[in-house]
């Protein structure tokens, strides 16, 4: 896992920046782990960043991610009259200038270096779930969530009409 000292250095600057033409309503520096307490880690390999889901050794430091929160209208047609209200969307940045991206064609989650404004693929609707968990739904593909597959992050289609276990799309956020 690579160091995240850059995150702390640019957190303050981000408060006054413009990512999508609007400023984030708030920011939160947190470690990201799965429902089963595996850590999400980031590693530089062959000049690109890889994302892993792994058990950390005792006392091994967790990687941190900067979550930037934004207000957004619901993306679906149901919200045409605004009755669905506003939601919270987030971008996730583990190190300066890099953000998690949804690659809907490959059903993968990738780290991309980005110019601002960030593309829609970098935005995720934040779902407040019970058990102190959250889920991240692709802004660009409603019903598709970040999830865990084969010790990697992947995009997983969640259909409310299906009987499926969603523990693999639940994540915990922790300041420690």
């Amino acid at each position: 896992a690579f160091g995240i000292s850059g995150v702390q250095k640019y957190t303050r600057a981000l408060h006054d920046s413009s990512i999508t033409g609007i400023s984030p309503i708030t920011e939160y520096l947190a470690s990201l782990s799965t429902y089963n307490d595996q850590s999400i880690t980031f590693a530089l390999e062959d000049e690109s960043y890889e994302i892993y889901v792994e058990d950390l050794k005792k006392d091994e430091k967790k990687d941190k991610v900067l979550l930037s929160y934004y207000e957004s209208q619901h993306p679906s047609n149901e919200s045409g009259d605004g009755v669905d209200g506003k939601m919270l969307m987030v971008t996730l940045s583990p190190t300066k200038d890099f953000w998690l991206h949804a690659n809907n064609k490959e059903h993968s989650v990738e780290l991309h270096k980005c110019e601002k404004p960030l593309p829609d693929q970098a935005f995720f609707v934040l779902h407040n779930m019970h058990s102190n968990c959250v889920s991240f739904e692709c802004k660009t593909d409603p019903g598709v969530f970040i999830g865990v597959k084969d010790n990697h992050l992947a995009l997983i289609k969640v259909d409310s009409s299906e009987n499926l276990c969603t523990e693999n799309i639940l994540f915990k956020l922790s300041e420690t």
Epitope: E27, Y28, A30, H74, G85, N128, S161, N163
Partner: antibody, heavy 121, light 111 residues
């Protein structure tokens, strides 16, 4: 138009039972967490119960004051959420509102008009 | 349970003047870097209506004169310039922990 319409309220004796229904329309009912909130005459709001989605195993949560007496359930094929109320007490007298949480589950943003339940002998 | 306490219980404000309502939680309602604190308006004979969520974000269609602030345990709802249609009871609510709890309400009237 997004709408929640409650029914089933009325006068019931202490110790009796009542089942409230809430018919939803104008949105994809199966995608939303549903709640019941009550308001005693001239008093404030009190959250009662919540039911989540199929892929959350339809988990349910209750206020301590009604746990074991009230049961929330849903029928997605009928776009309806229910509140089964047993062992009713005088202090359960209230207007009962059916309410939908927003997409993402941050707040309640759709409410029914409410149905009055009166528990009295 | 998290206890929500509002002050004052009632408030009389002249039209066009500022109205301020306070809400205190018995413990922090912050989680995931946001405050799980909502404000609702209820007019007589009507169900509540969302005004503010996560302490400071306006609900859809809510007039700009309504704003929210605060974090942790102390929160404020401000009506910058009271209008006749703002006469109502206002409730704060925490949605961090079950049971979700409301404040006792603050009645706002015209002076």
């Amino acid at each position: 138009e997004v709408q929640l319409v409650e029914s089933g309220g009325g006068l019931v004796q202490p110790g009796g039972s009542l089942r409230l229904s809430c018919a939803a329309s104008g949105f994809t009912f199966s995608n939303y967490w549903m709640n019941w909130v009550r308001q005693a005459p001239g008093k404030g709001l009190e959250w009662m119960a919540e039911i989540t989605l199929k892929f959350n195993d339809y988990s349910t949560h209750y206020a301590e004051s009604v746990k074991g007496r009230f049961t929330i359930s849903r029928d997605n094929s009928k776009n309806t959420v229910y509140l089964q109320m047993n062992s009713l007490r005088a202090e359960d007298t209230a207007v009962y509102y059916c309410a939908r949480r927003n997409y993402g589950n941050w707040y309640i943003n759709v409410w029914g008009q409410g149905t009055l339940v009166t528990v009295s002998s | 349970d998290i206890v929500m306490t509002q002050s004052p219980d009632s408030l009389a404000v002249s039209l066009g003047e500022r109205a301020t309502i306070n809400c205190r939680a018995s413990e922090s309602v912050d989680k995931f870097g946001v405050s799980f604190l909502n404000w609702y308006q209820q007019k007589p004979g009507q169900p509540p209506k969302l005004l503010i969520f996560v302490a400071s974000s306006q609900g859809s269609g809510v007039p700009d004169r309504f704003s929210g602030s605060g974090s942790g345990t102390d929160f404020t709802l401000t009506i910058s310039s009271l209008q006749a249609e703002d006469v109502a009871v206002y409730y704060c609510q925490q949605s961090k922990d079950i049971p979700y709890t409301f404040g006792q309400g603050t009645k706002v009237e015209i002076k």
